[in-house]
């Protein structure tokens, strides 16, 4: 008995397309082996018509495809433009045609249903508008005009020129009689429903001399576009519904069971909680098109998505729609990285961001997701030396450790830094990832003085106290600038007395600035790292002033004002225009967007052993 399963009988009509799904056990071998569709011959052989290795028979050229979905254990054979010659016995299978891992399918293509003479066929997409034109002769110009729909054996009145409208069409149909010169009336039906499909008859006059015209209305439900993305990666749905709905509310919904389509996001401000922090609905263009980006793809995100337009911001009968079937590949090329990073007020976090290692030269970005309106993600920092003004001195994007990962360090954390952040590049847009920063109770591990004032020409010593938990870590001091943090020489001054219950392994490491100059003014960080992996950091702002008295300055924790948020910013600091990710295709052009969020931010991350998806700034 073969483990392959599919439809035993498929019935269709000439000119139609069929979509045949074959199911197989999704073992590793099965997922990657050849898939085929073959036609059984009279003498028992089976001639391949299409296979997953790219072969397409001349009989199927331009009208068939085979798509494998390894995560689902299915492959789908689509065949278009069917003719009666396609009727026959087929097999869908795995491996070699003659080896038995297959399933028998009988395909029967019958002649299409004949249309009445002189029938005009209208083929229109669901939710769109159709105009049925009905000619008549002069003698019927003043007579009643009507449109009927054939229901079973009987014609049912849909609309007429005396003002009648069938309740099924209320609010979405009108009958227009052209100017006197034209012997034509037309019926316009908007927001087409699947149930509108069928045979119509328009008529001018009611007697034996009436003019009649047959119309066949076919309402097409959009075939879902198949989208196959990696777990933890991102997907962009581009939705172009046409200019006629440019001013109507837009939505993206995910079909659950039955007719239900749960709103994922819409332009009326609704957003499903499961997508908090990882979705953006891009502002629509003048033609009504828009796009939705979802990052941090999860297994449960797989499914059928519809975008549409309706004043309610959700799917209603007659909404114009586009459809996608999203598959989430669990054999992902995107490495696992923590989805939650925890830090304490005044502390720091070090976030690891994956990127496509083939694109090491791409520009790296980090942005803060904002949920207001349809979601946006203003840039905070990039790898080309741009840092948003409010983040100067406490945010750095480092190319280390490299080879597919970069690091973002944020310190001087406050509660306002809690939120969702996106890692991305100007290269492969599928590699956008999301991390949530949570601010938890606790004290920063590294202890430094608050803001420090140095005197021109003198020596300044700034202490940084490292608890014993960091005894095995490399300790460093560096000077922050827009492009990173340049390492400086520092002195290990032995055990620190700043920690209770901490043994000789605690450390006091000092930064010494000899003969202070104006150029020494700025932000300094002390921190820990292991190789190219960064842990916690603490920041100190050093101001430089002139002083009459000579000598050196040694700053202690007690003398310093330790307010973690306070910054003394030189008025010469440049305010660079705010940048925001608006276009999820990313940076075809850089767009400046007013950023209403004015935040001071910073944090140290703690390890939560309860979740492999969480990362602490001090752990590695």
């Amino acid at each position: 008995k073969s483990p392959i399963f599919g439809p035993e009988e498929v019935n269709s009509v000439e000119g139609n397309s069929v979509s045949i799904t074959c199911y197989y056990p999704p073992t590793s071998v099965n997922r990657h082996t050849r898939k085929y569709w073959c036609r059984q011959g009279a003498r028992g052989g089976c001639i391949t018509l299409i296979s997953s290795e790219g072969y397409v028979s001349s009989k199927y050229a331009g009208r068939a495809n085979l798509t494998n979905f390894p995560e689902n254990g299915t492959f789908v054979v689509n065949i278009a433009q069917l003719s009666q010659d396609d009727s026959g016995r087929y097999k869908c299978g795995l491996g070699i045609n003659s080896r038995g891992l297959s399933f028998d399918v009988s395909l029967e293509v019958s002649q299409g249903p004949g249309l009445l003479n002189d029938t005009k066929v209208y083929t229109v997409d669901l939710g769109r508008t159709v105009t049925i034109n009905c000619p008549f002769k002069t003698e019927n110009a003043q007579k009643r005009k009507s449109l009927y729909k054939q229901i079973g054996l009987y014609p049912v009145l849909v609309i007429d020129s005396s003002g009648y409208v069938n309740p099924n069409y209320t609010g979405r149909i009108r009958l227009d009689i052209q100017g006197t010169g034209q012997l034509l009336f037309s019926v316009v039906i908007n927001q087409l429903r699947l149930s509108d499909a069928g045979q119509y008859l328009c008529q001018a006059g009611d007697d034996s001399n009436s003019n009649k015209k047959n119309a066949d209305l076919q309402v097409l439900k959009p075939e879902p576009e198949l989208v196959y993305e990696d777990l933890r990666g991102s997907v962009t749905f581009h939705c172009a519904l046409g200019p006629e709905v440019a001013n109507v509310a837009k939505f993206l919904c995910r079909q659950s069971s039955g007719e239900n389509c749960d709103v994922v996001v819409n332009t009326l401000g609704k957003r499903a909680p499961a997508f908090e922090g990882r979705i953006l609905l891009n502002p629509q263009d003048k033609d009504g098109s828009f796009s939705v980006v979802i990052t941090g793809l999860r297994k449960e995100d797989a499914g059928r998505y519809l975008c549409g337009a309706h004043s309610d911001g959700q799917l209603q009968e007659g909404s114009p729609i586009q459809a996608w079937q999203l598959f989430v590949n669990e054999e992902s090329t995107i490495p696992r990285s923590p989805t939650v990073v925890k830090g304490v007020a005044g502390g720091s976090v070090a976030v690891l961001c994956p990127y496509n290692r083939k694109e090491s030269k791409s520009i790296k970005y980090w942005c803060l997701w904002e949920g207001a309106q349809n979601g946006r993600c203003p840039l905070l920092v990039d790898s080309e030396g741009w840092v948003k003004a409010q983040y100067e001195g406490r945010l750095s994007l480092l190319e280390e450790p490299g080879n597919g990962t970069f690091t973002v360090i944020l310190n001087q954390l406050t509660s306002r830094d809690a939120g969702f952040y996106w890692c991305l590049t100007n290269g492969d847009t599928l590699w956008r990832t999301t991390v949530e920063i949570k601010i938890i109770e606790g004290e920063p591990n590294l202890k430094v003085p608050g803001n420090v004032t140095a005197v021109l020409g003198e020596t300044l010593k700034v202490p940084c106290h490292f608890p014993c938990k960091f005894s095995s870590y490399e300790k460093y001091w560096c000077k922050w600038n827009n492009t990173g943090c340049q390492a400086l020489p520092s002195q290990d001054e032995g055990p620190s007395k700043a920690f209770v219950n901490c043994d000789e392994n605690s450390r006091l490491v000092s930064l010494t600035l000899n003969l202070v100059t104006r150029a020494d003014e700025g932000w300094y960080w002390c921190g820990v790292k292991q190789g190219h992996f960064y842990g916690e950091t603490a920041a100190v702002y050093v101001a430089v002033e002139e002083r009459k008295a000579a000598g050196s300055r040694d700053v202690s924790l007690a003398k310093a004002d330790a307010a973690p948020d306070e910054k003394v910013l030189d008025s010469g600091f440049r305010e660079i225009e705010n940048k925001a990710i608006q276009d999820p295709r990313l940076f075809a052009e850089e767009k400046a967007v007013a950023d209403t969020r004015d935040q001071a931010d910073g944090s140290r991350a703690s390890v939560d052993s309860g979740s492999s998806e969480e990362q602490g700034g001090s752990s590695r």
Epitope: V10, N11, S19, I20, V76, A197, S257
Partner: nanobody
Framework: EVQLVESGGGLVQAGGSLRLSCAAS????????MGWFRQAPGKEREFVAA??????????YYAESVKGRFAISRDNAKTTAYLQMGSLNPEDTALYYC????????????????????WGQGTLVTVSS
Amino acid sequence: EVQLVESGGGLVQAGGSLRLSCAASGRTFSSGIMGWFRQAPGKEREFVAAIEWSGGNTYKYYAESVKGRFAISRDNAKTTAYLQMGSLNPEDTALYYCAADESPSRYIDLRRPAPYHYWGQGTLVTVSS
């Protein structure tokens, strides 16, 4: 909301035949799927057969255990699905459920209950030896 009502169950001798009907009311589907599942006492619900229709196409699926003995069909106008059961044997004894859905994902295994949103109450088929 869609209601499904099964009928046609009963007691039949081994080797005999029965025809089950499943009538859907509440709304009509221009595309969709109707399937039959069965559950014998103390056993899990298992797939029997399904019929899917869309855009003038019909797809019929059968469980290995009923191939060649059972046939599924539907009456388009009456929104009713039928299961013609022949060569019945005592192993076919079970409560037979009808299930339906509008256009389930073509990529979900139709032999599992998950793709079906609407379910009937079941009709009992007893095959005596």
